[in-house]
């Protein structure tokens, strides 16, 4: 009984994900192999997190409205180990927009889902952010590593999105 | 005051090349963003090439990618267009361009008097 | 390539009144609150001056009979009360994204 309405409610929050969805890739978790944890397909996950490398060529800003009419947005690189994640995935002839912006110029990096900017938590490239004119980072192969460098936000990007785990 | 002025325009063959100078003076010219637009005779305006204050990216649109060529000089505050392979349709008048950044976008606000550059056989 | 579209292509108005140009973008060039729309005027043989940026930001030094309004993807550039020395052509430009793209201008004259 009880693990009928669990696969119930299952199947009633999928049809709720469909109409956003129309395919989820779901893999079992939890201590019981209760629990599932999906992405859109054909989206990639690492940690609780979903990703999407989109090859459509447009600025920041239409990047950022890309992402977020998929329920998503720019991404937000936390760590090392996530951005080694994203960049196994990524051509290393090509540039791509992360989340993170100076829509200023002040220099006052700011990610898209306001979280904090942590100097000591970044990948710039040896030399970068180099101008306050270019105010959107992207993520490129350069000296033989990945790394950020800040650019003029309308010149057109591949771009990165990110979104939280589904749930159910 | 701001002074752009613009040089090296003239009659060319097609297929031919040419190099345009801009003499910047009245800025610190090394930390502006530049931009190169053209207008051809009695038509409208168009973007030709953007590069930004260390000359380490530069843009282009389709119609001169591959054939143009824009940089800069900073000890000089000197701006460059190199244009190879002209063809009849890049005849215009050429103007160069302060830019500067609003938010997520720009602005061109000084813009020098243009050199005109004419290709013809 | 986001295409800027110009209306009327010229104009002509009597001194003291008003004058209104139109620009409409084939796709939103908004962003956050802000319109990546600019409006430039160029009088014969010189070249273009910048008067709005923003979609509605006068530009210092330009005078503020000149104003800018709109979002999304209509935008108007006004005059509103024509004084001989704008005798010009008028261009907006988006640079919300590459290729910057110009309408294609419109000239206003006296009645």
């Known amino acids: 009984n009880f693990m009928y309405s669990k696969t119930v409610k299952r199947l009633s929050k999928l049809q709720e994900y469909q109409q956003y969805y129309p395919s989820l890739t779901c893999v079992m978790e939890g201590k019981d192999m209760e629990d599932w944890s999906c992405c859109p397909t054909p989206w990639t996950s690492f940690q609780s997190s979903c990703y999407f490398i989109s090859t459509v060529m447009q600025s920041w800003t239409k990047s950022q409205n890309n992402c977020s009419v998929m329920g998503a947005d720019l991404v937000v690189i936390n760590t090392k180990e996530e951005q080694d994640f994203i960049t196994q995935n990524l051509k290393i002839n090509s540039a791509y927009f992360l989340g993170l912006s100076d829509p200023k110029g002040w220099r006052h990096w700011q990610w898209v889902d306001q979280t904090p900017y942590n100097k000591n938590v970044t990948f710039w490239h040896s030399g970068e952010p180099n101008s306050p004119d270019e105010r959107c980072a992207i993520i490129n192969f350069r000296s033989e590593e990945w790394g950020w460098n800040d650019v003029h936000c309308h010149v057109p990007q591949k771009s990165i999105c990110k979104m939280k785990k589904i749930y159910i | 005051e701001v002074q752009l002025l613009e040089s090296g325009g003239g009659l060319v063959q097609p297929g031919g090349s040419l190099r345009l100078s801009c003499a910047a003076s009245?800025?610190?010219?090394?930390?502006?963003?530049m931009s190169w637009v053209r207008q051809a005779p009695g038509k409208g305006l168009e973007w030709v090439a953007t590069i930004n204050s260390g000359g380490d990216n530069t843009y282009y649109p389709d119609s001169v990618k591959g054939r143009f060529t824009i940089s800069r000089d900073n000890s000089k505050n000197t701006l460059y267009l190199q244009m190879n392979s002209l063809r009849a349709e890049d005849t215009a008048v050429y103007y160069c361009a302060t830019y500067r950044p609003y938010y997520y976008g720009s602005v061109l606000d000084y813009w020098g008097q243009g050199t005109t550059v004419t290709v013809s056989s | 390539d986001i295409v800027m579209t110009q209306s009327p292509d010229s104009l002509a108005v009597s001194l003291g009144e008003r004058a209104t140009i139109n620009c409409k973008a084939s796709?939103?060039?908004?962003?956050?609150?802000?319109?990546?729309v600019n409006w430039y005027q160029q009088k014969p043989g010189q070249p273009p001056k910048l008067l709005i940026y923003?979609?509605?930001n006068l530009e210092s030094g330009v005078p503020d009979r000149f104003s800018g309004s709109g979002s999304g993807t209509d935008f108007t550039l006004t005059i509103s009360s024509l004084q001989a020395e704008d005798v010009a052509v008028y261009y907006c430009q988006q640079s919300d994204e590459d290729p910057w793209t110009f309408g294609g201008g419109t000239k206003v004259e006296i009645k």
């Open positions: 796709q939103s060039v908004d962003y956050d609150g802000n319109s990546y």
């Open positions: 009245g800025i610190t010219f090394s930390t502006y963003t």
């Open positions: 923003g979609a509605s």
